[in-house]
């Protein structure tokens, strides 16, 4: 049905007028406006920055916004004793240092308040030692580093290269072997594109350049020292001690001059292979420790910065809903950054806002959602997800029995190359269909559909004809509303070449080289990639607020169960004799995904031909519907990880950025031929199989005919 | 227009101590690694310390190391060169020197430098 139907309202506001009201020279000067200074949480600049948003939501018609603040845990370096790394001589003289501060971009010299490049929540610390380069520092990198090589990073400083998995990760998996610090740097392999050049010349890092971030593993838990529960006024606090995810060695981030300088003197083992060789024209030697002429000297970090209970603030919109006001649609993206945020998140803001005065514009000539939309700032996003975990755990029970959907408004660009979705299956057809009526902003495109281009530059691996879409994993704000509360959950983006640009992320990503030039000379100066992905949030939105039926399809969700399924079936079936001896079948799993898919099927067949003028009957499908999501849900949530409750998807436990599916069984039978008693951890295979087999069948029946 | 502008010297005895100052302008001094360099009567140019963009690094002549520090205020867009244990062969006209653009270069002393001041002369003897 098209949209127009879902309120009483002049054909004339439908989704083409909500689109032809987004404007790129909009969305432009909301950059720059959001980009002159520092927005770190917690700090007055960012508070100010949120009543500038709260007034002009206002302005631009909103029902209602309103601040919702939290007194949460945040960490800062400290001003008059900066944070650094030394290499030390046999008489503890320090004859090398690396940087306090990156090199300001032109133009911002004389901006005050460029907090340091820093690994927020490192505890404080000055341990010495040898240094052992432990590659990306991933779960197989330790692997081999421990287990092939032999090499022992006891007692030692590591360090690690930035990319391929979550920082947080990094430091825990260093932490596990025994590590008495890591230091984190970025290789020119992973942040700096052949044949572009650095900034401000072009969108590559400088030297001098670092990627500051948390290197928390909070595991969804939000606030470390309110787990569960809202920071508000009279929460119970816990002890430092017992904080959640905190890091328990000191951790410091580098650039690729100062990296140069550590790398270059080590000695020990030589890489094992070229996938642990970056481009530094540096040996890559593993450690422990420098070579010949340098083996006597040490490395010495030196961290003094602080964590603090700090108050942060949330703006929270609403557009009330004309039918069903008790249904919500939430736009949610952060608006705090490490400094300027040219593209993290302010890229995703100015989005936001120019949506924001489009719905405003149509609610002014008196169109209403039929849905309630409500619209979110975030805060603390970069300390850990903090803005949106804690008002969602305030406001949990509503959003579980009144959350439709959530799309999440982070960054717009990281790339200017082709779209990028991560969402529930439950949206795949509402992606594929909203993109095939947008027209595509790339060049060779003129005239084709954003789905015609998407799927040209990003073909589905398995559907011939169809554009990839990803899991979502975790790393930003949708996180509590899909992996705890099991609202359907979506997030869209420009992107880069995956085939061409090997490096993680994009180079500047958290530098104080994030800037609005670095997105007017170089990423999207028309900012006609910015109001695509505008058209795609916002006509999401849109879509999900206004159509009478849910666009939610089912059956696309029975056939990723069975794609799941075979996956994690052909994992456990590299043990076969194990299979055997302990008795592990599958059966219920597969069983369970056929009955969700007739059953999905069904009820399908039902949504084409059941009476969308009965008002009880269309609410109850929209409600089947509605509620798939959460039936997904297990309320003991996943081992050791109660805040990631989602059966079929949670971040992996070896990347929080990345998802893995059927989670449970997964971590189960990773690296299970280790285990020192076999028998227990197939019975913890068996156990999750049939937590799986179970939420799938439940969920199923949901589908069911009511009675 | 760059300049780069010092003052400080004067005659000293050996022993003594002096502190040189560089005012700079037409640049943001935070952006780069700078030097002082001297010239003796009748010498070729010899460098005396570099310090990095951010401070973090400081290197020394062997001539003068433990007796001279450089230092610098980047929010006032000076740099400093404190002289202690002066020496007759320290006489020489004082230059403070623009090195690379830390964007491009990471301030070490094989970077070189581009510009420099007029000079202060700096006389120790007795």
């Known amino acids: 049905k098209s949209s127009n139907e879902a309120t009483n309202i002049t054909p004339k506001h439908n989704m083409k007028a909500f689109l032809d009201e987004l404007k790129a020279e909009n969305i432009k000067k909301f950059l720059y406006n959001f980009t002159q200074i520092p927005h770190l949480a917690g700090t007055e600049q960012n508070f100010q920055l949120a009543k500038q948003i709260q007034s002009q939501w206002k302005e631009f018609g909103l029902d209602s916004v309103e601040l919702a603040h939290y007194d949460v845990l945040l960490s800062y370096p400290n001003k008059t004793h900066p944070n650094y790394i030394s290499i030390i001589n046999e008489d503890g003289n320090e004859i090398f240092n690396t940087s306090l501060f990156e090199p300001p971009p032109p133009g911002y010299e004389n901006v005050s308040d460029i907090v340091p490049p820093f690994s927020a929540f490192s505890p404080q610390g000055m341990p010495e030692g040898d240094l052992v380069y432990v590659n990306y520092a991933r779960t197989e990198d330790f692997f081999k580093l421990e287990r092939d090589m032999k090499i022992n990073c006891s007692g030692k400083i590591v360090i690690a290269r930035y990319g391929k998995v979550f920082r947080g990760n990094k430091v825990k998996n260093a932490q596990l072997a025994g590590a008495k610090g890591v230091i984190l740097y970025s290789d020119p392999a992973d942040y700096f594109a052949p044949g572009v050049k650095s900034y401000p010349d072009g969108w590559n890092l400088p030297g001098g350049g670092v990627q500051r971030g948390n290197i928390l593993n909070l595991n969804g838990a939000g606030d470390p020292l309110t787990p569960g529960y809202p920071a508000n006024e009279y929460a119970y606090r816990r002890g430092i001690a017992e904080a959640v995810g905190l890091p328990s060695i000191p951790v410091h981030p580098i650039g690729y001059y100062d990296a140069q300088k550590l790398l270059e003197k080590m000695g020990g083992s030589a890489p094992p292979d070229s996938s642990w060789r970056g481009s530094l024209k540096v040996p890559y030697n593993v450690g422990p420790g420098f070579t010949g002429n340098f083996s006597t000297q040490k490395v010495k970090m030196h961290i003094h910065s602080t964590n603090e209970v700090t108050r942060i603030y949330n703006v929270i919109g609403t557009l009330r809903g004309a039918v069903e006001p008790d249904r919500y649609v939430i736009l949610g993206g952060h608006r705090d950054s490490w400094v300027f945020g040219g593209i993290d998140p302010q890229s995703g803001a100015a989005v936001v806002h120019e949506i924001v005065r489009s719905f405003g514009t149509l609610k002014k000539e008196g169109w209403r959602p039929r849905r309630t939309i409500l619209f979110a700032s975030w805060d603390a996003e970069e300390f850990g997800l903090l803005g949106s975990t804690e008002w969602a755990e305030e406001n949990s029970r509503l959003l579980q029995e009144r959350g439709v959907a959530y799309i999440n408004a982070d960054s717009s660009i990281e790339g200017n190359y082709t779209l990028r979705v991560d969402c529930t299956p439950l949206m795949y057809s509402l992606v594929h269909n909203l993109t095939k009526e947008l027209k595509s902003p790339d060049e060779g495109f003129e005239g084709k559909s954003l789905y015609e281009s998407w799927t040209k530059k990003s073909p589905s691996p398995e559907f011939s004809g169809m554009p990839r879409i990803s899991k979502l994993g975790s790393g930003n704000d949708f996180e509590v509303f899909f992996q705890r509360l099991g609202i359907a959950s979506g997030r869209a983006r420009y992107t880069k070449n995956w085939e061409t640009n090997k490096f993680s992320g994009y180079p500047l990503y958290h530098s104080v080289y994030e800037t609005y030039e670095l997105v007017e000379k170089f990423y999207d100066p028309m900012f006609k990639y910015h109001l695509t992905v505008a058209q795609v949030r916002g006509g999401m939105v849109f879509e999900l607020a206004n159509s009478i039926v849910l666009p939610f399809d089912c059956r696309d969700y029975a056939v990723v169960l069975r794609k799941y399924a075979d996956k994690i079936y052909s994992i456990s079936m590299k043990h076969p004799q194990e299979m055997k001896t302990y008795s592990v079948s599958f059966d219920s799993l597969f069983s369970a995904v056929k009955n969700f898919t007739e059953i999905a099927s069904k009820f399908s067949e039902r949504l084409q031909d059941f009476d969308k003028s009965n008002p009880i009957v269309l609410r109850m499908m929209n409600d089947q519907l509605m509620f798939l999501e959460r039936a997904f849900i297990d309320p003991l949530g996943l081992p050791d990880r109660p805040f990631y409750r989602h059966v079929i998807y949670a971040p992996s436990s070896h990347n929080k950025y990345a998802g893995e599916s059927f989670p449970g069984i997964y971590d189960a039978l990773f690296d299970i031929e280790s285990k020192v008693d076999p028998s227990k951890a197939w019975g913890e295979v068996k156990r999750q199989i049939y937590v799986a087999a179970f939420t799938v069948q439940a969920a199923a029946e949901t589908l069911s005919e009511v009675a | 227009e760059v300049q780069l502008v010092e003052s400080g010297g004067g005659l000293v005895k050996p022993g003594g101590s002096l502190r040189l100052s560089c005012a700079a302008s037409?640049?943001?001094?935070?952006?780069?690694?700078m030097y002082w360099v001297r010239q003796a009567p009748g010498k070729g140019l010899e460098w005396v310390a570099v310090i990095s963009y951010d401070g973090s690094n400081k290197n020394y002549a062997d001539s003068v190391k433990g007796r001279f520090t450089i230092s610098r205020d980047n929010s006032k867009n000076t740099l400093f060169l404190q002289m202690n244990s002066l020496r007759v062969e320290d006489t020489a006209v004082y230059y403070c020197?623009?090195?690379?653009?830390?964007?491009?270069?990471?301030?070490?002393?094989?970077?070189?430098?581009?510009?420099r001041g007029q000079g202060t002369m700096v006389t120790v003897s007795s």
């Open positions: 020197a623009k090195g690379g653009n830390a964007l491009y270069s990471s301030g070490w002393p094989d970077d070189g430098f581009d510009i």
């Open positions: 037409g640049f943001n001094l935070i952006s780069y690694g």
